[in-house]
């Protein structure tokens, strides 16, 4: 039909466009003609894939017309001037909106060209991680909570430990109808080890620049770990006072320590103060056995030590620890 | 008021040609494509061809195979269709009609017979 | 060449009766469609473009829809003056190509 050997005219259209659910968004659509080429629009047409009708049209007389006057308008087309760009925007962004449409020309004398794009209506999550506060379970359990609330499509959550363990993701429908809220646990066994350590969540999602890190420090409760420190093997009599430390980790902190011995309350020379045990000068050897036990909320553990003070004072001063 | 007034009948014997007038007021001429259909009597509408006034660009319906020719007078707002080779089945009422993508007016008609 | 197919070719009607004409394409033609009224001794006059919308001066009782391939042209409540033919027309692809007509006559 056109005259053989002429440049065809193009129409121009990305193959897919974003909007985000209640924002507007243009769907660009331009007729690219060649310099020597020559064309006239009569008629700028948009439909929907799957819809009978179109959904917009302008008319080189009758100007715009509209399916839904509201909430359509082309961007740039006017009467009384070359009907070349049929960009299109659309307030209000519903979720039913996505979906594929045709950009359609009807020129002289080429005939109509046209061109499909897809709209993408997405929806920006919002993201929060948490911890789940666990204790000594010995299975595995939620440690962490990471969370991205009313996406679309639904964000991928990913995670990254140090620690072990492994995910366990679940998705439920948004609070916007066609919006997805992604919930995605960290689950491993429980340990004191485990108790002040870090997990990352990571979410992805095509409405972000770059991913979201969310790090969630964890809390694991476990009674007290004891251990008391402090002796060395080598006190004697006659030397300055030394002292014990009763070490305890737990979670909750300690809420109080008990010095004791296997045969029962503490002898003159050793005096609690706290979570230290002082013990005073002797003239006599000693061999006792000292025990510190030690509370918190989830219960009480305890630690023993054996000390030793011995005749004899050694070689070079070491013994009992100088304050 | 947009005007399309055309030519008078025409009667022509076979073999001949004939070339009918489309005289248009009421808009600017250049700025739509001018198109010609036409209607044996009693019978449906076929479209012949189209031109553009300001570029000269057209398009045929390849059925008319060369024997149409489309023309126009810019300074007279006035386009011409030219039909050669006449035979019988050529008689009908030939319109021309302002194009829009559709057709939204029309010249009042030409009837062309071909006779012997 | 794309083919239209109209029917009824010929239908009558009472004033206040709904009358549906359809037109079907023999391939896909989107909604490059337009309708047209013919009165007799009269030239064809412009009814519908883009398959659904009609001329401004155009009775709101004219209503055309449909995409694709079917397409249909509703008058809502006949009057005497619509009286005529009528014929849709695709301008999808060249050739242009019309319908073969319905003949709408007033019981």
């Known amino acids: 039909w056109p005259p053989p050997g002429t440049g065809d005219i193009i129409v121009q259209a990305p193959t897919q466009v974003p909007g985000f659910l209640g924002d507007s968004v243009t769907l660009p659509c331009y007729l690219q003609v060649p310099g020597m080429e020559e064309t006239h629009v009569s008629q700028l047409t948009w439909s929907r894939h799957g819809e009978s009708g179109s959904m917009a049209v302008f008319h080189q007389t009758q100007g715009p017309n509209y399916s839904e006057p509201k909430r359509l308008e082309f961007v740039a087309a006017r009467l009384g001037t070359e009907l070349r760009d049929a960009s299109l925007r659309m307030f209000g962004l519903r979720v039913e909106d996505e979906g594929n449409y045709t950009c359609l020309f009807v020129t002289f004398p080429q005939g109509s060209r046209s061109v499909d794009i897809w709209l993408r209506v997405l929806a920006k999550p919002q993201n929060t991680a948490e911890v789940q506060k666990v204790q000594l379970t010995g299975k595995p359990v939620p440690v962490a909570r990471c969370v991205s609330t009313g996406g679309r499509p639904p964000a991928h959550i990913t995670w990254h430990s140090d620690l072990g363990g492994m995910p366990n993701t679940s998705q439920a429908p948004g609070f916007l109808s066609g919006t997805v809220t992604v919930t995605s646990l960290w689950i491993l066994v429980p340990s004191s080890q485990v108790d002040g350590k870090s997990v990352t969540c990571k979410v992805e999602h095509e409405s972000f620049e770059k991913p979201q890190l969310l790090t969630v420090n964890l809390t694991v409760y476990y009674p007290p770990e004891v251990s008391i420190s402090g002796y060395d093997n080598n006190w004697y009599l006659s030397q300055n006072e030394a002292t014990l430390t009763c070490d305890a980790r737990s979670n909750p902190e300690p809420t109080g320590y008990n010095w004791s011995t296997t045969m029962g309350p503490l002898p003159p020379f050793a005096v609690a103060q706290g979570a230290q045990l002082l013990i005073r000068p002797v003239d006599k050897p000693i061999n006792t056995t000292f025990i510190c036990n030690v509370t918190n909320a989830l219960g009480a553990r305890q630690a023993e030590l054996t000390v030793q003070v011995k005749e004899g004072p050694p070689s070079e001063p070491s013994g009992m620890s100088s304050n | 008021e947009v005007q399309l007034v055309q030519s008078g009948s025409e009667l022509k014997k076979p073999g001949a040609s004939v070339k009918i007038s489309c005289k248009t007021s009421g808009y600017t001429f250049t700025e739509y494509t001018m198109h010609w259909v036409r209607q044996p009597h009693g019978k449906g509408l076929e479209w012949i061809g189209g031109i553009h006034p300001n570029s000269g660009g057209t398009s045929y319906n390849q059925r008319f195979k060369g024997r149409v020719t489309l023309t126009v007078d810019k300074s007279t707002s006035t386009a011409y269709m030219e039909l050669s080779s006449l035979r019988s089945e050529d008689t009908a009422v030939y319109y021309c009609a302002r194009w829009t993508g559709d057709f939204d007016y029309w010249g009042q008609g030409t009837l062309v017979t071909v006779s012997s | 060449d794309i083919v239209m197919t109209q029917s009824p070719s010929a239908m009558s009607a009472s004033v206040g009766d709904r009358v549906t004409i359809t037109c079907k394409a023999s391939q896909n033609v989107g909604t490059n469609v337009a309708w047209y009224q013919q009165k007799p001794g009269q030239p064809p006059k412009a009814l519908i473009y883009s398959a659904s919308y009609r001329y401004s001066g155009v009775p709101d009782r004219f209503t055309g829809s449909g995409s694709g391939t079917d397409f249909t042209l509703t008058i809502s409540s006949l009057q005497a003056e619509d009286l005529a033919e009528y014929f849709c027309?695709?301008?999808?692809?060249?050739?242009?190509?019309f319908g073969q007509g319905t003949k709408l006559e007033i019981k």
């Open positions: 027309q695709q301008y999808q692809s060249y050739p242009y190509t």
